[in-house]
């Protein structure tokens, strides 16, 4: 017998699936070809099957959907819209599926979606309305609680002529839909900076992972509003020093643990306040592992072991006294 589908039309908001319906009565609990299903675990796994589209005949009971290791390329509007809707779908993993384009409304009609993992996809074209589903200034709140976007930066030759950081942040902030987001992972994305408004508009964050990026400074980033923040991962960036404003904000967060390993700390006179703070604070995990990278004479010195006499700056000579 031929396969059947339980998908159908949400005409205006999900044009892609308007035609995904079978001629036969739907069998909502059947398992799609090339997938493994466990009704008891409410789980469907369609993993490493070179799928080019999201299966149309997903069982209505699915709570956890793994579509990893495929070749999806593009997620159109309403890619998961079905009739009846996938009302139970809570965790969706699309990592490593060669997605380079996620369109507005791609995750619409998933009322219970709490965890979304798009990691390891070269997202050259992430719509600002990928998560909000609408271009309204204030959208309906997204149910998302965890958004995992590790290593979504495309190769340099595939990036568009715009800021990758800006594209991602636009999607995070559109319509203020992600006000309930508690975990955001943005590791390994070559971020050079963090746009200053992003954290202020994600007030529910408990966990923020910015590790393995290229962040040089946090000077313009405010953590003040993140009163629920419990973990902040900044390992493996290009941070040289944390300044007083940042230190005070971090110290003021009641539950915070900060991870700062493997940054190229510059141990000169500008580092004095940070060293003092490190010696007193309990918020930095593994603070005894932090070492200087520059200047050369300070390389590998442990920050906690430095004193003010170690932290000098070479005097800046007036131009007339500088030698070439």
């Amino acid at each position: 017998s031929s396969p059947t589908s339980s998908a159908s039309s949400f005409s205006s908001s999900a044009p892609f699936l308007a035609s995904a319906v079978s001629a036969q009565p739907p069998l909502p609990d059947q398992c799609p070809a090339l997938c493994e299903c466990s009704e008891a675990a409410r789980t469907v796994k369609c993993v490493n099957r070179n799928l080019t589209e999201v299966p149309t005949d997903l069982p209505a009971y699915v709570r956890n959907l793994f579509l990893t290791g495929n070749q999806l390329a593009v997620l159109p509007a309403g890619a998961f819209a079905r009739r009846p809707p996938l009302a139970e779908l809570a965790a969706l993993n699309l990592s490593g599926s060669r997605l380079d384009e996620v369109r507005a409304g791609a995750f619409e009609h998933l009322p219970s979606l709490r965890q979304l993992d798009l990691s390891h996809n070269p997202l050259a074209d992430l719509s600002p309305f990928a998560f909000s589903g609408s271009n309204a200034s204030v959208s309906a709140p997204s149910p998302l609680v965890e958004l995992i976007l590790n290593h979504i930066v495309p190769p340099e030759d595939e990036r568009q002529n715009r800021s990758f950081e800006g594209m991602v942040v636009a999607a995070l902030l559109a319509g203020r839909a992600l006000q309930g987001l508690r975990r955001l992972e943005l590791a390994s994305n070559h971020f050079l900076y963090l746009p200053r408004d992003v954290l202020a508009q994600l007030p529910s964050l408990r966990h923020l992972d910015l590790s393995n990026n290229s962040l040089v400074s946090l000077t313009y980033v405010s953590f003040r509003n993140l009163t629920h923040l419990e973990s902040l991962h900044l390992e493996d960036n290009a941070l040289k020093v944390l300044h007083n404003g940042t230190l005070a904000e971090l110290q003021g967060l009641p539950h915070i643990r900060v991870f700062l390993d493997n940054n190229p700390w510059v141990c000169d006179c500008h580092m004095a306040d940070m060293v003092t703070w490190l010696k007193e604070t309990e918020v930095v995990q593994g603070k005894d592992r932090l070492t200087c990278a520059y200047p050369e004479k300070m390389r590998n010195r442990v920050l906690l072991e430095l004193n003010s006499a170690d932290l000098d700056c070479d005097p800046i000579l007036p131009p007339s006294l500088q030698t070439s």
């Epitope: 090339l34 369609c46 070179n50 299966p55 005949d57 070749q71 390329a73």
Partner: antibody, heavy 120, light 111 residues
């Protein structure tokens, strides 16, 4: 050489049924999505239905939804279109066509077509 | 549904002369990653054949006198020097979303 050969067309009365087949050769059939496209006499091309390579995704034009069913048998390198409740306006040449994916794909190989005539 | 509108609906060209066919989509069929617009030629008594995919990519085996351009909603198919074997009906088609739709066709004749 890529070859697609349709069969199963013919004359059928309104309300009747017909099953079209498409035999594929010269390529790894199970790696490709497949479409049916039709062309009414003297008219342009109309997309009818799509099935993904592993039969995980199915899409239909509104004009045939609920009446036509697309299916495939990768072991037999064959594509099918079951057509029920046929109408006069279903009269057309039906082509099967190959694609590498639905949205990022295109119709890169076509069969010669099989003619379906719905008439009383 | 996305409506594809081709102009002109027919044209008659002297061999060796250029020809141009326009295709307009009722909404954008381009993203920054891909252009979802393709061109086909249906010669008399034959099935269609792919000429150009993703707006500007020449299908293997298609003569390089054919070229495609455009993005967003406006696309063009050009034949630099028309030959007798180019006669037939030319169709544009989008693959932005379901349903996939074709233009109404442009009939090319030789003068």
């Amino acid at each position: 050489e890529v070859q697609l050969v349709e069969s199963g067309g013919g004359l059928v009365q309104p309300g009747g049924s017909l099953r079209l087949s498409c035999a594929a050769s010269g390529f790894t059939f199970s790696n490709f999505g497949m479409h049916w496209v039709r062309q009414a006499p003297g008219k342009g091309l109309e997309w009818v239905a799509y099935i993904s390579s592993g039969s995980t995704s199915f899409y239909y034009a509104d004009t045939v939804k609920g009446r036509f069913t697309i299916s495939r048998d990768n072991a037999k390198n064959s594509l099918y279109l079951q057509m029920n409740s046929l109408r006069d306006e279903d009269t057309a040449v039906y082509y099967c066509s190959r694609t590498n994916s639905l949205l990022r794909g295109f119709f890169d190989a076509w069969g010669q077509g099989t003619t379906v005539t719905v008439s009383s | 549904d996305i409506v594809m509108t081709q102009t002109p609906l027919s044209l008659s060209v002297t061999p060796g002369q250029p020809a141009s066919i326009s295709c307009r989509a009722s909404q954008s069929v381009s993203s920054s990653s891909y252009t979802y617009l393709h061109w086909y030629l249906q010669k008399p008594g034959q099935p269609p054949q792919l000429l150009i995919y993703s707006a500007s990519n020449l299908e293997s085996g298609v003569p390089d006198r054919f070229s495609g351009s455009g993005s967003g909603t406006d696309f063009t198919l050009k034949i630099s020097r028309v030959e007798a074997e180019d006669v037939g009906v030319y169709y544009c088609q989008h693959s932005w979303e379901i349903p996939l739709t074709f233009g109404q066709g442009t009939k090319l004749e030789i003068k």
